[in-house]
């Protein structure tokens, strides 16, 4: 029987910069029941606080609700693991909420086949940013990525759309049914999950184009 091994806070995420959750990985348990506590202080403070919510994020987590979350202050946190034989501490972790945002997927993905008379046909798609993300404040830049594939294909074709919320693709296989998805990330954050798949049937008379794709 031994003191617990050193835990590690390995992940922190915020859906919208208004709340966030951090997760830790326990070290070895030393063969005894182990209690974990997360303590933190914010930059400029000396007063240590204990995690406000160990429940919401699931096992080995700490959730910071709205009243505990500040974008203006760096959080300095560590996890203490304790059993009957002793204690061990994780390394200190520094968290700036701006840099841990993982948004929800983009919304309202619509996909259409456009066949203008004077030009080659193309696939046109548009979407909206996730509702929880406030883009009006200016500091939040979302980047988008699209993936699509014929229904029965194994490989996805991926396109980076930058900050655009619409996109054209010119090279597709006629007669095929395609799945299309989109995801987003803040410049210094994490990719969202992919949006639910939207299906589109490419007409049999769709003319393949030499050029691959371009932004709108």
């Amino acid at each position: 029987q031994l003191p617990p091994g050193k835990p590690e806070i390995f992940k922190c995420r915020s859906p919208n910069k208004e709340t966030f959750t951090c997760w830790w990985r326990p070290g070895t348990d030393g063969g005894l029941p182990t209690n974990y506590s997360l303590t933190y202080h914010r930059e400029g403070e000396t007063l240590m606080h204990e995690c406000p919510d160990y429940i919401t994020g699931g096992p080995n987590s700490c959730h910071f609700g709205k009243q505990y979350t500040s974008m203006w202050r760096t959080y300095v946190m560590m996890v203490n693991a304790t059993n009957q034989m002793g204690s061990s501490f994780s390394d200190e972790l520094y968290v700036d909420v701006t840099y841990i945002v993982q948004p929800d997927p983009p919304l309202e993905l619509t996909v259409e086949v456009k066949q203008p008379e004077d030009r080659k046909p193309y696939l046109w798609m548009k979407w909206s940013p996730p509702t929880l993300i406030d883009l009006k404040t200016g500091w939040f830049t979302l980047l988008y990525e699209i993936r699509l594939k014929p229904e029965k294909a194994a490989e996805w074709e991926t396109h980076f759309a930058g900050q655009q919320t619409e996109f054209k693709i010119l090279s597709l296989h006629p007669g095929q049914k395609y799945l299309v998805q989109v995801r987003c990330k803040p410049d210094h954050g994490y990719w969202s999950a992919w949006s639910p798949a939207t299906f589109i049937q490419i007409p049999s008379d769709f003319i393949m184009n030499d050029h691959h794709h371009h932004h709108h």
């Epitope: 390995f10 992940k11 974008m71 972790l93 520094y94 700036d96 500091w139 990330k185």
Partner: antibody, heavy 118, light 112 residues
């Protein structure tokens, strides 16, 4: 203990490429961005770019875009910085650095001296 | 790119005496999220840089309280209240508000 251990010194010819490695240990490699910075002899520090090891997303200093390539190998917890079309002005010590969940970095590798000389 | 200008270039200080280094940026370092990402590093002879101060005034873990940072907007200062022999090296300011991140040219601190 967090450690970033870099590959050894290199001597390269002008026009060639160099690939510097940075092996991370003591933490979950995919959790934090890796930055690359260089320091020419007797000079200041110059930021080359950064990579998120979880998905290989990169941000580059425009000055190095097209010439520097940042990659990671998750299986070995190693980050790489490759610089192509080397010229004598690229002679420098190249450092990798690790951030927290922040945009500043607190852990640095020991540095790799790259000498470009004909 | 944001240009970071440090003064003085070098500083010779008697142990126990204070020292002050100035750093000026060519544009405001206030991020659109309200934070100011101005940091100070020390590079001791033959070593890699080490973080002293993050976000203007916050001492990093293990940094002695004789080091303090202050400033706002474009003008920043690092102060050492009582210089010790182990403080010798080159001090760099750095900004990570704007990409590319940039560094000052450095201030060499020596002991008299």
């Amino acid at each position: 203990e967090v450690q970033l251990v870099q590959s050894g010194a290199e001597v390269k010819k002008p026009g060639s490429s160099v690939k510097v490695s940075c092996k991370a240990s003591g933490y979950t490699f995919t959790s934090y961005w890796i930055h690359w910075v260089r320091q020419a002899p007797g000079q200041g520090l110059e930021w080359i770019g950064e990579i998120d090891p979880s998905d290989s997303y990169t941000n580059y200093n425009q000055k190095f875009k097209g010439r520097a390539t940042l990659t990671v190998d998750k299986s070995s917890s190693t980050a790489y910085m490759e610089l192509s079309s080397l010229r004598s002005e690229d002679t420098a010590v190249y450092y990798c650095g690790r951030s927290f969940f922040t945009n500043w970095f607190a852990y640095w590798g020991q540095g790799t001296l790259v000498t470009v000389s004909s | 790119d944001v240009v970071m200008t440090q003064t003085p270039l070098s500083l010779s200080v008697t142990p126990g005496q204070p020292a002050s280094i100035s750093c000026r940026s060519s544009q405001s370092l206030v991020h659109s999220n309200g934070n100011t990402y101005l940091h100070w590093y020390l590079q001791k002879p033959g070593q890699s840089p080490q973080l002293l101060i993050y976000k203007v005034s916050n001492r990093f873990s293990g940094v002695p309280d004789r080091f303090s940072g202050s400033g706002s907007g474009t003008d920043f200062t690092l102060k050492i209240s009582r210089v010790e022999a182990e403080d010798v090296g080159v001090y760099f300011c750095s900004q990570s508000t704007h990409v590319p991140f940039t560094f000052g040219g450095g201030t060499k601190v020596e002991i008299k």
